[in-house]
């Protein structure tokens, strides 16, 4: 069987060789070939070349579509670091500093307080807040951290909340809160973090951070 295949391949190769030789002879204008034969052979050859070129174009298109598909789903991720603020607002402030991440302009940190996304989709959103408080120095109310959402044309809403009671340690006891969940965000949606007492938040390296990634 293998031997027959080999003979078949050789025969095809020989036919291809003869065909190419004939085209060459047609081009050099050899008298031994009729004009009609030459025209027929040339059009056959042009047909082959056209097919090859079309196939090439299709492959190019497919590849460029793959690239576009890749562009349509770029990685969107952000991780920002807490920033001490003189403002008395309960909304925490963040900065692109230290070992931060801002994948591209499809997610931005606005006014140092909120992460805003440009594309709709499911996002994992998280925040870690470390705070140092003392039972005697603080009010009776627990320390509460809230992850909030503001979408265009909508009121802001709380997505996640966590509460910790104050420590009895002096001058204060460090505790950490971690919030994280998967949420559908609309284009232009912003997420931010609220706390009951921003003055108690720890801003040392790695203690307090905030981020998101598109799934």
């Amino acid at each position: 069987h293998r031997r027959l295949d080999k003979i078949e391949d050789e025969r095809n190769l020989h036919e291809d060789f003869v065909f190419m030789k004939t085209i060459q002879r047609c081009n050099t204008g050899e008298r031994s070939l009729s004009l009609l034969n030459c025209e027929e052979i040339k059009s056959q050859f042009e047909g082959f070349v056209k097919d090859i070129m079309l196939n090439k174009e299709e492959t190019k298109k497919e590849n460029s579509f793959e690239m576009q598909k890749g562009d349509q789903n770029p990685q969107i991720a952000a991780h920002v670091i807490s920033e001490a603020s003189s403002k008395t607002t309960s909304v925490l402030q963040w900065a692109e500093k230290g070992y931060y991440t801002m994948s591209n302009n499809l997610v931005t940190l606005e006014n140092g307080k909120q992460l805003t996304v440009k594309r709709q989709g499911l996002y994992y959103i998280y925040a870690q807040v470390t705070f140092c408080s003392n039972r005697e120095a603080s009010s009776q109310a627990p320390f509460i951290a809230s992850l909030c959402l503001k979408s265009p044309g909508r009121f802001e809403r709380i997505l996640l909340r966590a509460a910790n009671t104050h420590s009895s340690a002096k001058p204060c006891g460090q505790q950490s809160i971690h919030l994280g969940g998967v949420f559908e965000l609309q284009p232009g949606a912003s997420v931010f973090v609220n706390v009951t007492d921003p003055s108690q938040v720890s801003h040392g390296t790695g203690f307090t951070s905030f981020g998101l990634l598109k799934l």
Epitope: S151, G153, R154, F155, E156, R157, I158
Partner: nanobody, 122 residues
């Protein structure tokens, strides 16, 4: 069970004022935006005003802007609508309403009260 109970409606002369109240119960009042809508005789429902869960964000229909003020007291689970410079065209049944969505201009309500009638006439 969610309940919304409006009060404060009545007959008032053009240019007069009224304050509507809505007592809410059966849900966590401070976690939801609240709305006032109205229905004039023989007309459809019209959105009047919206207020965010914590209060500072308020929105109004153009027809009442500058004359009506929406507010809330989360400690009392109560929504208010202060209506000044009332006109004949403000005559309607006023409803307070809650939506599970957080739209500034509501498209759907899951609960609303029985309404309170406001009549502006000389």
């Amino acid at each position: 069970e969610v309940q919304l109970l409006e009060s404060g409606g009545g007959l008032v002369q053009p240019g007069g004022s009224l304050r509507l109240s809505c007592a809410a119960s059966g849900f966590t009042f401070d976690e939801y935006p609240m709305y006032w809508v109205r229905q004039a005789p023989g007309k459809g429902l019209e959105w009047v005003s919206s207020i965010g869960p914590s209060g500072p964000n308020t929105y109004y229909a153009d027809s009442v802007k500058g004359r009506f003020t929406i507010s809330r007291d989360n400690s009392k689970n109560t929504l208010y609508l202060q209506m000044n410079s009332l006109r004949a065209e403000d005559t309607a049944v006023y409803y307070c309403a809650k939506s599970p969505y957080f739209d500034v201009i509501p498209s759907y309500f899951d609960y609303w009260g029985q309404g309170t009638l406001v009549t502006v006439s000389s």
